[in-house]
Interface confidence: low
């Protein structure tokens, strides 16, 4: 038996910038029951506050909801292990809300064959920035990204689209089904997942529609 | 897992033809182009041309038409390329490569030497 | 055809060291589709070549974020970061834009 070992915090994201979430590695435990505690303080204050929610996020975690979020803040985190042999206390971490969004992926893929006159196909991949952003206010700038391969290749290919919420995707094979998704990132912030997998078949015979 | 496996080296006289072979294997042969390409000793890599194993429609380097002749066989997923009246100068290592998505080759044979020498 | 000019023909570098290979096509390489067709390839001794980047700066599966691969036009360039014992070899760069498709002369990488 001995005092707990020393805890890491693993990361914290922000789907919004509005609520965010810290989680942590427990260190070991020493063989005791430990509990662990979150505290935070806020760049230029003196107070030092415990983590408002454990429960929200799942074990080892803290949700900072609306209520105790400030984009304009740094905070300065620390978790700490407790059992009866004693404590140990993690290597802070400073989280500006800013930095750490991590959106939904994009909605509302939408998958269509079209022909060029010199009778070239290609794909025209569309979608829409996910529900919580705020990208039409500036509040937001998100980038993205779209990945495709055909159904039965081994690799991704991946086009970065920019700003852009449209992309043609050129060379792709008649009678060939492929499989598209798409992902986002906010300037200073992480990528989303990949987004819901569709799917569209290119046609071997495609002609053109007036 | 992808694979090209080439026929192995061939020593041939001035005026006569090779025919090298490339066995596909781990994907569908159909659905993917195969180019070939040389390289002489010590030299760069040289486009020969390529073929659609679907329909067998060919585009050639216009160096390599009317000397080159690329084939498919589907039943066994087997491209080849033949080259005739053999000079010299086509003593290279010939490797077939499959397309990724279009026209880039992210899959390469081993590589068939072939030496031209009287 | 579209010759292919790289430079420079050899290059010596240190392990932990940055290395650039400059690729100069005759003519533009932008395709009608707005796609660019510019490939690198790296054949390692006894090898046959591999693909690095596709596209210009698609950094194939499997390569290390060390490569990368940037231009437009005529103008190509493709960096390594942090040159490697296991990167030395020959780089072609490639233009798969017009027929025929054609390659560069190579660049041959080795190790100080």
């Known amino acids: 038996q001995s005092p707990p070992g020393k805890p890491e915090i693993h990361k914290c994201r922000s789907p919004d910038k509005e609520t965010f979430t810290c989680w942590w590695n427990p260190g070991s435990d020493g063989g005791l029951p430990t509990n662990y505690s979150l505290t935070y303080s806020k760049e230029g204050e003196k107070n030092t506050y415990e983590c408002p929610d454990y429960k929200t996020s799942g074990p080892n975690s803290c949700f900072f909801s609306k209520q105790y979020t400030s984009i304009w803040k740094i905070y300065i985190i620390t978790v700490n292990a407790t059992n009866e042999m004693g404590s140990s206390t993690s290597d802070p971490l400073y989280v500006d809300v800013t930095y750490i969004v991590e959106p939904e992926p994009p909605r509302n893929l939408t998958l269509e064959v079209k022909q060029l006159k010199d009778k070239k196909t290609y794909l025209w991949v569309k979608w829409l920035p996910p529900t919580i952003t705020d990208v039409k206010t500036g509040w937001f700038t998100m980038e993205y990204e779209i990945r495709l391969k055909s159904e039965e290749a081994d690799e991704w290919e991946i086009h970065f689209t920019g700003h852009q919420t449209q992309f043609k995707v050129f060379d792709l094979y008649p009678g060939q089904k492929y499989l598209v998704q798409t992902r986002c990132k906010p300037d200073h912030g992480y990528w989303s997942r990949w987004g819901q997998e569709k799917s569209i078949e290119i046609p071997n015979d495609f002609t053109l529609k007036d | 897992e992808v694979q090209l496996v080439q026929s192995g080296a061939e020593v041939k006289k001035p005026g006569s033809s090779v025919k090298v072979s490339c066995k596909a294997s781990g994907y569908t042969f159909t659905s993917y182009w195969i180019h070939w390409v040389r390289q002489a000793p010590g030299q760069g890599l040289e486009w020969i041309g390529e073929i659609d194993p679907s329909d067998s429609y060919t585009n050639y380097n216009q160096k390599f038409k009317g000397r080159a002749t690329l084939t498919v066989d589907k039943s066994s997923s087997t491209a080849y390329m033949e080259l005739s009246s053999l000079r010299s100068e086509d003593t290279a290592v010939y490797y077939c490569?499959?397309?990724?998505?279009?026209?880039?080759?992210?899959?390469w044979g081993q590589g068939t030497l072939v030496t031209v020498s009287s | 055809d579209v010759v292919m000019t790289q430079t420079p023909l050899s290059l010596s570098v240190t392990p932990g060291q940055p290395a650039s290979i400059s690729c100069r096509s005759s003519q533009s390489l932008v395709h009608s589709n707005g796609n660019t067709y510019l490939h690198w390839y790296l054949q390692k001794p006894g090898q046959s070549p591999q693909l690095l980047i596709y596209k210009v700066s698609n950094r194939f599966s499997g390569v290390p974020d060390r490569f990368s691969g940037s231009g437009s036009g005529t103008d190509f360039t493709l960096k390594i970061s942090r040159v490697e014992a296991e990167d030395v070899g020959v780089y072609f760069c490639s233009q798969s834009t017009h027929v025929p498709f054609t390659f560069g002369g190579g660049t041959k990488v080795e190790i100080k």
């Open positions: 490569g499959r397309s990724f998505f279009t026209n880039w080759f992210a899959y």
